[in-house]
């Protein structure tokens, strides 16, 4: 592969629907812009979840209608997905690009397995 | 200004040896991972070799077509990447092209190989 | 291996025209693919990194798009400076497997 990106191989998310793993990567040199996206894949279909470019030192903005939301430290992105029901049970991979300066590298992670578990409705009470 | 120097081509007989340079200036040579790539007019541009940098302990590759008689090697102090080249064949002609990362690309040096 | 598969092998179209040059990969390559310039004596240069975006100095009229297996190089207003070789790299996994190139020439 090219620039390794190593990423928890599975995560389960919260009651809430939330789940957050670190992608870590392997830097041949000094990026100073980054751009970090997860992908999901099921059924040999992959789509792209969110995207955020960021400079190294500063937060990673996402899209205000992102579901993602992640901080960096170093080669490291602590990425969390909100939002996410059962249906959304599948193969997430990190993907990471490091923009600037050239040349440019690119790698992606072998993904994590979010499990999401809806949860069950509360019983009525009289 | 990035420049990529490419020295020590030239005729050679097959099953001969030959040792390529390539002399980089204008970026940071040892944050980057260097390749070889040829162009032959019957295969178009064929990538050879790549040595990684330090945070990946120096991991080289090969293609297949060269794996076992080519070595590509680094010299950080020089900012210097070469290509050793054994036993050559006519497939090998071309003319080999030194690139950083696959962004900067050195005016290449032509290999013959011909009785 | 990853094998790229370029079309077409050569075109000729008109200066102003615009003209696509497709390339496909054998696997999902994750958008880790460039495209190249090679002018006749000169060495190739890269024109679009990461699929979509386009290197320092080339002319905002090339862009490139797509996504898994299936990319596109597109030259809008075709100057006759334009006139190449232009190939498609996978940059995802070694070997770093290059198209068969695209010959454009004006008409």
């Known amino acids: 592969k090219a620039m390794h990106v190593a990423q928890p191989a599975v995560v389960l998310a919260n009651s809430r629907g939330t789940a957050s793993f670190v992608c870590e990567y392997a830097s041949p040199g000094k990026a100073t812009e980054v751009r970090v996206t997860v992908l999901r894949q099921a059924d040999s279909q992959v789509t792209e979840v969110c995207a955020a470019t960021y400079m190294m030192g500063n937060e990673l903005t996402f899209l205000d209608d992102s579901i993602c939301t992640g901080t960096s430290s170093g080669n490291q992105v602590n990425l969390t997905i909100q939002g996410l029901r059962a249906m959304d049970t599948g193969l997430y991979i990190c993907k990471v690009e490091l923009m600037y300066p050239p040349p440019y590298y690119m790698g992606i992670g072998n993904g994590t397995q979010i499990y999401v578990i809806d949860p069950e409705p509360c019983p009525d009470s009289d | 200004e990035v420049k990529l120097d490419e020295t020590g081509g030239g005729l050679v007989q097959p099953g001969r040896s030959m040792k390529l340079s390539c002399v980089v200036s204008?970026?940071?040579?040892?944050?980057?991972?260097m390749n070889w790539v040829r162009q032959s007019p019957e295969k178009g541009l064929e990538w050879v070799a790549q040595?990684?940098?330090?945070?990946?302990?120096?991991?080289?590759y090969y293609s297949d077509s060269v794996k076992g008689r080519f070595t590509i090697s680094r010299d950080d102090s020089k900012s210097t990447v070469y290509l050793q080249m054994n036993n050559l064949r006519a497939e090998d002609m071309g003319v080999y092209y030194c690139?950083?990362?696959?962004?900067?690309w050195g005016q290449g040096t032509l290999v013959t190989v011909s009785a | 291996d990853i094998q790229m598969t370029q079309s077409p092998a050569s075109l000729s179209a008109s200066v102003g025209e615009t003209v696509t040059i497709t390339c496909g990969a054998s696997?999902?390559?994750?958008?880790?693919l460039n495209w190249y310039q090679r002018k006749q004596g000169k060495s190739p240069q890269l024109l679009i990194y990461g699929a979509t975006n386009l290197a320092e100095g080339m002319s905002s009229r090339f862009s490139g798009s797509g996504s898994g297996r299936q990319y596109s190089l597109k030259i809008s207003s075709l100057h006759p400076d334009d006139v190449a070789t232009y190939y498609c790299?996978?940059?995802?996994?070694?070997?770093?497997?290059f198209g068969g190139g695209t010959k454009l020439e004006i008409k």
């Open positions: 040595i990684r940098n330090k945070p990946y302990n120096f991991e080289t």
């Open positions: 790299q996978n940059v995802l996994s070694s070997p770093w497997t």
């Open positions: 696997e999902n390559i994750y958008g880790g």
């Open positions: 204008g970026f940071t040579f040892s944050d980057n991972w």
């Open positions: 690139t950083g990362g696959f962004t900067y």
